[in-house]
């Protein structure tokens, strides 16, 4: 969490941003809140990006003002206009690109004063893994697949019964480039698995960590997946 104070001495307002990550090709949110004002027409929101000459987005006098918007953000940004009055200056970003990564500044002016806070935005690709029993294999084998990752992640297998065991000798991981030539499909195979055990396939890069669990017993198979973004800290 980054909390920024106003830059005009005693006329300062608190602006709060949260570092976040965007998934390439999907929509992202750059989060920013501020001390609200009672009049929408008195609120100015400016989003800026380090190294970019034009604005990312500007909202003032109750409407968007995009004449100074940088070309790379054209048609891709929107504030939640109905939530500005309650102090929400968050920005919606359409179709996140790798090049959207960087340092953003949320700059606010109200009748109470000015304030700003920076936000680190990471971009990459991350997706839920799915673990299945591979019945085509000669021995009991598990197959962990996740459709979209970037940068290339690490894949580690673990099991509830053999805690701390190193499965690198009995697993094989491959990365297949997807059609857009950026993200990759992750496939990891674990051999010689035993029943009545829970196995976890953990995929991680510097943006996200995802886990796919599978519990195989004589009578049933249970699956569970979990994804968590890393380094989501507020300013």
């Amino acid at each position: 969490l980054i909390i920024g104070f106003g830059i005009s001495g005693r006329h300062s307002i608190t602006v709060t941003t949260v570092a976040s990550a965007g998934n390439i090709g999907e929509d992202g949110i750059l989060s920013c809140t501020f001390e609200p004002d009672i009049k929408l027409s008195d609120i100015v929101i400016q989003w800026l990006k380090e190294g970019v000459i034009g604005l990312v987005h500007e909202f003032k006098e109750g409407k968007d003002e995009l004449s100074e918007q940088d070309e790379m953000f054209r048609g891709r940004t929107a504030v939640f206009a109905d939530q500005v009055i309650v102090g929400n200056a968050s920005l919606r970003l359409k179709n996140v690109q790798l090049t959207d990564a960087g340092t953003y500044k949320c700059y606010i002016i109200t009748s109470k004063g000015k304030g700003n806070a920076n936000l680190e935005y990471k971009t990459g690709a991350f997706s839920m893994p799915e673990v299945n029993v591979d019945y085509n294999a000669s021995s009991e084998t598990l197959r962990c697949e996740a459709p979209r990752w970037f940068p290339q992640p690490t894949v580690v297998w673990a099991s509830q019964v053999d805690q701390g065991a190193n499965f690198s000798e009995v697993s094989n991981t491959s990365f297949e480039l997807n059609s857009e030539n950026v993200t990759m499909k992750v496939v990891s195979v674990l051999y010689n698995v035993t029943i009545n055990n829970t196995y976890s396939c953990m995929i991680e890069n510097d943006i996200a960590k995802a886990t796919g669990d599978i519990k195989v017993t004589e009578s049933e198979i249970k699956r569970r997946s979990h994804l968590q973004l890393l380094n989501s800290k507020a300013s």
């Epitope: 090709g25 999907e26 929509d27 034009g54 987005h57 409407k63 968007d64 003002e65 995009l66 004449s67 100074e68 918007q69 940088d70 070309e71 054209r74 048609g75 891709r76 940004t77 929107a78 919606r92 359409k94 179709n95």
Partner: antibody, heavy 119, light 107 residues
């Protein structure tokens, strides 16, 4: 309320150019992009291009060599020019505005101007 | 170029019937699909944006759903005034593209 209105020539000679003006009211051209879409007789809709608030343009690659879109913010007017028209460019030409600043759907359309390409 | 394929090309329905119009994108377009109704001699009217959001003033018997490549527009109980062409379009990537339309006729 928000309105867009196209004004065009109606008839264009083959190989000549087409100029249409879209005059908007109820919103500012510095807040929203304006798109151009056409519909040939009995056919579907075809997106031609857009001019954004900052003056940047994006064109359908099939028309990029003969299409130009510009605007005058102070007059709330957008100008569409297409060169080298042929018979298959006969269509109703619309200007349209998106629902938000992110292009999610064209909520506002002009009434359209029918352009016939014929000698 | 993303191709939007609409089906069926036309359909004839009785008042009160439930119908589903389909739109398939040739590649992932997220939820950036909108649906339009166009009556004879009129401009298209936005019904649904963002795949499932009903536009202001659109009757609630129109419902949109879907994501990625498969989208549907459902009319839960067809009214006589629903006689029109219906178009889907994607605004995910350039060039923005539309389907060829579905003509709805009332029996």
């Amino acid at each position: 309320q928000i309105q867009l209105k196209e004004s065009g020539p109606g008839l264009v000679q083959p190989s000549q150019s087409l100029s249409i003006t879209c005059t908007v009211s109820g919103f500012s051209l510095t807040s929203y992009g304006v798109h151009w879409v056409r519909q040939s007789p009995g056919k579907g809709l075809e997106w031609l291009g857009v001019i954004w608030s900052g003056g940047y343009t994006d064109y359908n690659s099939a028309f990029i060599s003969r299409l130009s879109i510009s605007k005058d913010n102070s007059k709330s007017q957008v100008f569409f020019k297409m060169n080298s028209l042929q018979a298959d460019d006969t269509a109703i030409y619309y200007c349209a505005r998106d629902i938000t600043t992110i292009v999610e759907g064209f909520a506002y359309w002009g009434q359209g101007t029918l352009v016939t390409v014929s000698a | 170029i993303i191709v939007m394929t609409q089906s069926p090309k036309s359909m004839s329905m009785s008042v009160g019937e439930r119908i589903t119009l389909n739109c398939k994108a040739s590649e992932n377009v997220g939820t950036y699909v909108s649906w339009y109704q166009q009556k004879p001699e009129q401009s298209p009217k936005l019904l649904i944006y963002g795949a499932s959001n009903r536009y202001t003033g659109v009757p609630d018997h129109f419902t949109g759903s879907g994501s990625a490549t498969d989208f549907t527009l459902t009319i839960s109980s067809v009214q006589a005034e629903d006689l029109a062409d219906y178009h889907c379009g994607q605004t995910y990537s350039y060039p923005f593209t539309f389907g060829s339309g579905t003509k709805l006729e009332i029996k």
